[in-house]
């Protein structure tokens, strides 16, 4: 008799793929055209990335550092109208993209919550949640919660409102903290909260250190669903050396949890790489005309258009990973086991029941390394075969689909491999 299938876990929509943050509408759409109506025209692009949710805004009225001129219920007319927002929601829904609204109050100001002492604004967030839930949003994000007095109790209240409306709604909180204890204490009072933090960016970017960070985080958070990012708002390029971008994309897409990216991460957009750009919100490089002020400042391989035409580009890698992440059971909700490998490497396996299994091997080092995979510390349910098929490499030169002998596996500097192998009873 065939072994009995393992019961599938309950899957919420944010478990099924990546979230994509657009914190600045104008910068995302390019010069002078940043509004909600224009964003509607970019939904096909988001569909091509296979992201499951769009974290948008803030969009509300906010005069820098002025509580009285901040209205969480009103869209800033510069971004469009409530009608434009409703239209965007409808269009996103048709494309199966969920919309999460950022309600961080003082987004134009220095302190995102005005000051630690101000709690009248936090009191009103609950009304805003109800208003925007009625309007049809799929969830909310609030950032810099370490600057909010009684953050845990406010988050608990906001989560109750969000989940009370529907279990299918999501609350994301962001913190600049990289301290695991602080992160865990924020998570403790909120069972379904997704928390983005600077935890992974507090790293020396070595295989051993990253492995230790990930395993400590997973151990500390128990069996709750995690999110993975390097910060609550910034671009990957702001935290990572360029040579590790591909490696981190592979890692973020294959760790157990929801990967969260910022617009431009998929093309390696750099903060303030071009003159006159704001550091926190660089203009998205759609094509070579994205930066008309300085002719020749943008080359094709920096843009969405150029990278879309190049199968070896970062954007192509992102799309491939996103596709795998959203359809493979082992990557969707599979068990996660790390195991010993060569120094400088971080290796793990993702497996679910009798489904195809995935092996991830990441070389953080500047030199080529032998993988040295040692499966002795893996449970019997997750043993390694002698060969696995290459799904993708972060570096050019390997043939996708080719079988690789795991004992002889060697990785190039900064190379990451995603390999698959079948379940054997």
């Amino acid at each position: 008799r065939a072994p009995r299938c393992r019961e599938l876990p309950a899957q919420k929509w944010w478990h099924t793929g990546a979230l994509y943050r657009i914190g600045d509408l104008q910068a995302f759409q390019g010069h002078g055209s940043g509004n909600l109506a224009g964003l509607k025209g970019r939904l096909d692009y988001l569909s091509s990335l296979k992201v499951k949710g769009l974290v948008l805004g803030p969009l509300h009225k906010n005069q820098k550092d002025d509580v009285a001129q901040t209205d969480l219920l009103q869209i800033d007319p510069n971004f469009g109208s409530k009608e434009d927002f409703d239209n965007l929601l409808q269009s996103a829904k048709k494309k199966s993209i969920r919309v999460i609204l950022d309600l961080t109050p003082n987004y134009r100001g220095e302190n995102l919550w005005f000051s630690t002492q101000v709690d009248s604004v936090a009191t009103k967030v609950k009304d805003a949640l109800e208003f925007w839930l009625q309007a049809g949003v799929d969830g909310f994000q609030v950032r810099d919660i370490e600057n909010l007095k009684d953050a845990s109790s406010f988050l608990a209240e906001w989560e109750n409102i969000t989940k009370g409306f529907s279990e299918d709604r999501l609350l994301i909180a962001g913190t600049n903290s990289s301290d695991l204890q602080q992160i865990v204490s924020l998570l403790e009072s909120n069972k379904d909260l997704l928390l983005t933090s600077s935890y992974l960016s507090d790293s020396s970017f070595t295989g051993e250190h990253t492995k230790s960070l990930v395993t400590q985080y997973l151990n500390a958070t128990g069996n709750r669903w995690c999110s993975w990012s390097l910060s609550q708002a910034g671009l990957l390029t702001s935290f990572l050396p360029a040579q590790l971008l591909r490696l981190y994309q592979l890692m973020l897409f294959t760790l157990p949890g929801t990967p969260v990216f910022s617009y431009g991460d998929e093309i390696g957009l750099k903060a303030a790489a071009l003159p006159g750009q704001p550091v926190e919100a660089p203009v998205m490089l759609w094509d070579e005309s994205s930066f008309p002020d300085i002719p020749g400042a943008v080359s094709a391989n920096m843009t969405v258009k150029g990278q879309s035409e190049d199968p070896g580009s970062l954007l192509s890698l992102f799309r491939q990973l996103s596709d795998q992440r959203s359809k493979e059971r082992s990557l969707l909700h599979g068990d996660f086991h790390t195991f010993s490998s060569g120094p400088g490497l971080f290796s793990y396996i993702r497996h679910w029941d009798q489904n195809e299994r995935f092996l991830v091997v990441l070389n953080f080092g500047d030199v080529g390394l032998s993988a040295g995979l040692q499966a002795s510390d893996l449970p019997a349910s997750a043993s390694l075969p002698t060969k696995a098929d290459l799904v993708l490499s972060t570096q050019p030169g390997r043939e996708e689909g080719s079988p690789l002998e795991l004992e002889r596996l060697k990785l190039e500097p900064h190379e990451g491999l995603l390999l698959r192998f079948p379940y054997v009873a």
Epitope: V67, L73, F114, Q117, V118, D119, D127, E130, F131
Partner: antibody, heavy 115, light 107 residues
Framework: QVQLQESGPGLVKPSETLSLTCTVS????????WSWIRQPPGKGLEWIGY???????NYNPSLKSRVTISVDTSKNQFSLKLSSVTAADTAVYYC?????????WGQGTLVTVSS | DIVMTQSQKFMSTSVGDRVSVTCKAS??????VAWYQKKPGQPPKALIY???YRYSGVPDRFTGSGSGTDFTLTISNVQSEDLAEYFC?????????FGSGTKLEIK
């Protein structure tokens, strides 16, 4: 220009419930916060609470056990009920729009609690 | 609750003078303070919000200042129509609270 007008009985007996309605004209009651404030004779102003059009409320803890504020968006009205009144509840009652501070006010209505 | 104290119940001034009404918060309220003018038989009228911003249509002889716990409403070149009671209000925390008021009398 938003205008507000309070209406309701000017005299209420002790232990009964005070009921007032505020009609908003010149603007929609949706997407704003609507408050009740009172001023007892010779005293300062006291915020009673607010309602938002979803029905979400926030009350002054000193009155919370006795206060109910409700909204009727179809009539562009919101209402105040204050139960178990005593002579200390005698005051001019104002309705107002709140944007943390109060930018539009009704004229106010004097409610006397007396047998 | 945050207590807003207006220690002067009455202030006397002459037309053309400059007068300052003060208000003290029992804890730090940042700049989250508004000022109102109230005349007998009328509802209060917003003058100042965020401690220093004049509400639309308010004459520029009214200015607000202060932050933290100490706030001042200054009326320069006092006019006879400024005869009224002035209240401060904090909106840093709920419940929203008002000062007890300062009555301005014209000599």
């Amino acid at each position: 220009q938003v205008q507000l007008q309070e209406s309701g009985p000017g005299l209420v007996k002790p232990s009964e419930t005070l009921s007032l309605t505020c009609t908003v004209s010149g603007g929609s009651i949706s997407s704003s916060y609507w408050s009740w404030i009172r001023q007892p004779p010779g005293k300062g102003l006291e915020w009673i609470g607010y309602i938002y059009n979803s029905g979400s409320t926030n009350y002054n803890p000193s009155l919370k056990s006795r206060v109910t504020i409700s909204v009727d968006t179809s009539k562009n009205q919101f209402s105040l009920k204050l139960s178990s009144v005593t002579a200390a509840d005698t005051a001019v009652y104002y309705c107002a729009r709140e944007t943390y501070y109060f930018d539009y006010w009704g004229q106010g209505t004097l409610v006397t609690v007396s047998s | 609750d945050i207590v807003m104290t207006q220690s002067q119940k009455f202030m006397s001034t002459s037309v053309g003078d400059r007068v300052s009404v003060t208000c003290k918060a029992s804890q730090n309220v940042g700049i989250n303070v508004a000022w109102y003018q109230k005349k007998p038989g009328q509802p209060p009228k917003a003058l100042i919000y965020s401690a220093a911003y004049r509400y639309s249509g308010v004459p520029d002889r009214f200015t607000g200042s202060g932050s933290g716990t100490d706030f001042t409403l200054t009326i320069s070149n006092v006019q006879s129509e400024d005869l009224a009671e002035y209240f401060c209000q904090q909106y840093n925390s709920y419940p929203l609270t008002f000062g007890s008021g300062t009555k301005l009398e014209i000599k």
